[in-house]
Interface confidence: low
């Protein structure tokens, strides 16, 4: 197409030789005339500039827009395309001229002593060795060395074209150091120039940007982006960057090769883009493309440019976190900001440091949350540049599934005397408090193991049918009291009690407490016996070093073979939801004890004495009696608790006080200890004696001084003593005012 003029107005230049191909002999003269409709120019082989001395281009004598090209004594190297064209257009006429020079059948380029061919080892690629011919129909082969190999055209992938050269798959000659073309004419061999073979790679393994993501800056900061291309050996790389503000004044690009370890099968190239002071217009996508000619790989990253440093909380930041005891708690500090803020966590105002139980970083992690972790956690974000602070409070509430206190305290196998009224208790600790505590029951015989069955510790009662206590038909008459709330060991607990009006039937009772995070249950074996009865002499709960006797009384006409046992440790612990094994069915866990037998008119009494009871004597004691007729064993279990000896302590302080004459003073002195201590009062180190005005009550715990007089002023001491020592507290009572004189007549 013509440039600047409509193409329809111009015909192609007309050549005097109307052929596509012209073959002439060497040493003859080549002359071609070209006529057209505008200014014309010629181009010919080996000299595109028109400065060749041998070639002559002249204006025709017979007309405008006509030029003749003349080459006297042509040689093989004059072979090629001769083009006549209109200036400044693409309109041209071409003739290809072969100058047959049998002494020099290959066209040599003017300057080359040897050529270079670049190849890749790609199986699908072919390479052209540019050994052009001055004769069109030569018989040409390609020689490669070393070792010497010859390749001949095969009509398929190996071919020779006089205008193009020798074409061959590149991998076939990748071993060679050099190649050349050879033509046979009348048994003479003619060689082209040598071509050095250079194997170039093309594979790019990857292109990596660093930083790869999350790049944030504020206006005026420096951006440095590194683009690394990893390639196979013998690869050259061109880098090309695309970025938002191409006209940037302060942009700098540096490309360099990186050294790799010797023997490495890989090359590395690095391109670094630097913008010294970014502006908002530099925000956007940055793309680095690495090209090896045959392959291009690229990678991109987004650069965010902020107007100025800032910090703010993200809207996913929790204000309330709820967890259950034992869980791992994660509270992430969700923020928006640049640069990333410094993060500091506080609990109830105290800084948190990381340790094996807690990690205080971008995410506050509590490995195994417990009740004491409940509280307010403050996270403070500080922008490291502007020092701007943002704070946020997260309330952590730790929930506790119901735990039933008596499970670990009371024997799971207590026995109860027929006809008695009994109270069963479940003390539940849970956060939040249980939304219900339900009681269930079932008959013992429906659940107890048959003698033939092996006792399974994990499921000793093969029964599932628990009945609501409202349905007490066939069982004991029951009443469930309203739940009470009590502060026990500093914890708010819910106490549920079930009253059995008359113990007539052996049964199992289960209390089940449920709150929002779980459930807890306790199974009570309520074994009713008409048989033996256990009593403790002299006290239900002896203190260590005191003596205690356990009495087992049984009707002599009904029972025989009274024996005392102590229940040993369970062979396996009883897990939540499992039922205790009936004690008479499993004597393996019992230790037989020495005891003394007494009798009266109706009963046998088996007495087991513990002299100087110790804490090791605590546990479950079993009295076993055998029915004289049926030989069935009856067991009664009593849990013995031995109280630890504790030296006296006085809780609370006596306060110094000032009182006016005629008023009253009331003070309290509460002492604890085991055995319980005796309380004594002293005034000015002398024993305080009760009289009409001085009253001691509640085992001397409370002291009242009525209508105080000036002489009641002084140092008062409360002293609590037991065999384990004494404790005392003191206070000074000041009496103000003048003593009234009274007349005694």
């Amino acid at each position: 197409a013509s440039v600047g003029l409509p193409s329809v107005s111009l015909d192609l230049p007309r050549l005097s030789i109307q052929k596509d191909i012209l073959t002439i002999k060497a040493n003859t003269t080549l002359q071609i005339t070209c006529r057209g409709q505008r200014d014309l120019d010629w181009l010919w082989p080996n000299n595109q500039s028109g400065s060749e001395q041998r070639v002559e281009v002249t204006e025709c004598s017979d007309g405008l827009f006509c030029k003749t090209l003349t080459i006297p004594k042509v040689i093989g190297n004059d072979t090629g395309a001769y083009k006549c064209f209109y200036r400044e257009t693409d309109l041209a006429s071409v003739i290809y001229v072969y100058v047959q020079d049998y002494r020099s059948p290959f066209i040599a380029s003017v300057s080359d002593q040897h050529g270079v061919v670049y190849i890749t080892e790609n199986k699908n690629k072919t390479v052209v060795i540019p050994c052009l011919g001055s004769i069109s129909n030569l018989n040409v082969s390609l020689c490669a060395r070393y070792p010497e190999k010859r390749f001949v055209p095969d009509g398929n992938r190996i071919s020779w074209d006089s205008k193009k050269g020798f074409t061959i798959p590149s991998y076939m000659i990748s071993y060679a150091g050099m190649v050349f073309c050879e033509a046979k004419i009348n048994d003479e061999s003619y060689q082209s120039i040598m071509y050095i073979v250079v194997v170039v790679g093309y594979r790019i393994y990857d292109v990596v940007l660093s930083p790869s993501h999350g790049i944030e800056l504020s206006v005026g900061e420096k951006l440095v982006l590194n683009c690394t291309a990893r390639t196979e050996l013998n690869v050259g790389i061109d880098f090309n960057w695309e970025y938002p503000s191409s006209k940037h004044q302060h942009k700098k690009l540096v490309n360099r090769d990186l050294k790799t370890q010797s023997g490495s099968e890989m090359k590395k190239f690095l391109s670094t883009l630097t913008i010294d002071g970014v502006t908002r217009s530099d925000q956007g996508l940055y793309t680095c493309a690495a090209s090896s000619g045959l392959m291009t790989k690229k990678n991109s990253t987004f650069v965010r440019v902020h107007e100025k440093p800032f910090v703010a909380f993200g809207s996913g930041m929790e204000s309330l976190v709820e967890a259950t005891v034992g869980e791992r708690v994660r509270i992430p500090a969700k923020y928006l900001g640049y640069p990333p803020p410094e993060i500091k966590w506080y609990k109830n105002g105290i800084p948190l440091e990381s340790n094996h139980t807690i990690k205080a970083g971008h995410v506050l992690t509590i490995m195994e949350v417990s009740e004491r972790d409940t509280g307010n956690y403050t996270v403070i974000l500080t922008n490291p540049i502007s020092k701007e602070k943002q704070s946020h409070v997260v309330s952590l509430v730790v929930y506790v599934p119901p735990q039933i206190g008596e499970k670990s305290l009371i024997s799971p196998v207590d026995s109860y005397q027929y006809g008695t009224t009994q109270t069963l208790t479940c003390t539940v600790y849970a956060i939040p408090p249980p939304h219900h505590i339900h009681w269930y029951w079932q008959l013992e015989e429906e659940c107890a193991n048959e003698p033939s069955q092996a006792v399974s510790v994990t499921n000793p009662y093969p029964c599932e049918e628990w009945r609501s206590v409202e349905d007490f038909q066939g069982g004991n008459k029951i009443e469930v009291n309203k739940n009470q709330f009590a502060l026990i060991e500093g914890k708010n607990k819910t106490v549920s009690t079930l009253v059995i009006q008359a113990a007539n039937v052996s049964a199992l009772y289960k209390c089940e407490a449920v709150n929002k995070v779980g459930r807890g249950e306790r199974v009570i074996s309520f074994h009713v016996t008409r048989g033996p009865e256990i009593t403790l002499q002299p006290d239900m709960q002896p203190t260590e070093q005191e003596s205690v006797s356990l009495w087992c009384t049984a009707d002599r006409s009904t029972f025989e073979n009274l024996t005392w046992y102590k229940l040993g440790p369970q062979p396996l612990p009883i897990h939540v939801g499992e039922l205790p094994t009936p004690v008479c069915k499993n004597l393996d866990t019992l230790w037989k004890l020495n005891a003394t037998m007494f009798s009266n008119s109706t009963n046998d009494i088996l007495i087991m004495e513990l002299k100087n009871a110790s804490l090791q004597d605590q546990g479950d004691y079993v009295c076993l009696a055998q029915d004289r007729k049926t030989k069935k064993r009856h067991c009664v279990v009593r849990q013995l608790t031995v109280l630890e000896r504790v030296a006296p302590t006085i809780t609370g302080n006596l306060e110094n006080q000032t009182t006016s004459i005629g008023e009253s003073i009331e003070v309290s002195c509460t002492a604890s200890g085991n055995p319980p201590p005796q309380i004594m009062w002293f005034k000015d180190n002398e024993t305080l004696v009760e009289d009409s005005g001085i009253v001691l009550k509640d085992g001397n715990r409370n002291l009242t001084i009525r209508r105080v007089r000036k002489e009641d002023e002084g140092l008062y001491t409360c002293q609590a003593c037991s065999v384990l020592g004494c404790a005392k507290v003191e206070a000074f009572f000041i009496i103000e005012g003048a003593q009234e004189k009274t007349n005694l007549e």
């Epitope: 800032f310 909380f313 996913g316 943002q390 946020h392």
Partner: antibody, heavy 119, light 112 residues
Framework: CQSLEESGGDLVKPGTSLTLTCTAS?????????MYWVRQAPGKGLEWIGC???????TYYTSWAKDRFTISKPSSTTVTLQMTSLTAADTATYFC????????????WGPGTLVTVSS | AVVLTQTTSSVSADVGGTVTIKCQAS??????LAWYQQKPGQPPKLLIY???DLASGVPSRFSGSGFGTEFTLTISDLECADAATYHC??????????????FGGGTEVVVK
């Protein structure tokens, strides 16, 4: 092609309850997503109701929505808005929208579903 | 809680002209602001986020600016198709979930 569609809009009487469902097509919710409910009374502006953090399951509500509106995620492609004690003031087109991670602008919206509360 | 105010409820301009819509925040919200376009019977469509970043597929005729409390949406070379209501939305969060999704009241653009 990723899209959201709300359903469940209806004419209901004051004091009743209604549940709207937002169904995702062409994608499943991922931990990076937050799903939102926004409403628009006829001729009025947009009003943010609340959202659910798909990653943690945490829900967030605007102050007036706390007591009567509940957002939940029954499946990996549905989010619901449960509304109770409806009044005429709740008459609006209800949209569900999605944001991906931070920050919380809404990149995908459903076409909306109309809820009319009238006796 | 952040309150966004779009003082102008309606603005009109000629085809080919330029229109500017303002949005004011009751407190510093940095650049945490988005703009949406809403046509009748359709859901809103995100135009701008981070106060000035163009959402994908949005023509460069739309631009956003501002930081802190004052924000502006500019539409140049106005086309008929730009007739719609434009809403601003803050996604700044200062500690109460009620802050999370404040919207402005909306500004209607009428193209003559």
């Amino acid at each position: 092609c990723q899209s959201l569609e709300e359903s469940g809009g209806d004419l209901v009487k004051p004091g009743t309850s209604l549940t709207l469902t937002c169904t995702a097509s062409g994608f499943s919710f991922s931990a990076r997503h937050f799903m939102y409910w926004v409403r628009q009374a006829p001729g009025k502006g947009l009003e943010w109701i609340g959202c659910i953090d798909i990653g943690s399951g945490s829900t967030y509500y605007t102050s007036w929505a706390k007591d009567r509106f509940t957002i939940s995620k029954p499946s990996s492609t549905t989010v619901t808005l449960q509304m109770t004690s409806l009044t005429a003031a709740d008459t609006a087109t209800y949209f569900c929208a999605r944001s991906s991670g931070y920050p919380y602008y809404f990149t995908l919206w459903g076409p909306g579903t109309l809820v009319t509360v009238s006796s | 809680a952040v309150v966004l105010t779009q003082t102008t409820s309606s603005v009109s301009a000629d085809v080919g002209g330029t229109v500017t819509i303002k949005c004011q925040a009751s407190e510093n919200i940095y650049s945490l602001l988005a703009w949406y376009q809403q046509k009748p019977g359709q859901p809103p469509k995100l135009l701008i986020y981070s106060a000035s970043d163009l959402a994908s597929g949005v023509p460069s005729r739309f631009s956003g600016s501002g930081f802190g409390t004052e924000f502006t949406l500019t539409i140049s070379d106005l086309e008929c198709a730009d007739a719609a209501t434009y809403h601003c939305q803050s996604y700044y969060y200062s500690g109460s979930s009620a802050d999370t999704g404040a919207f402005g009241g909306g500004t209607e653009v009428v193209v003559k």
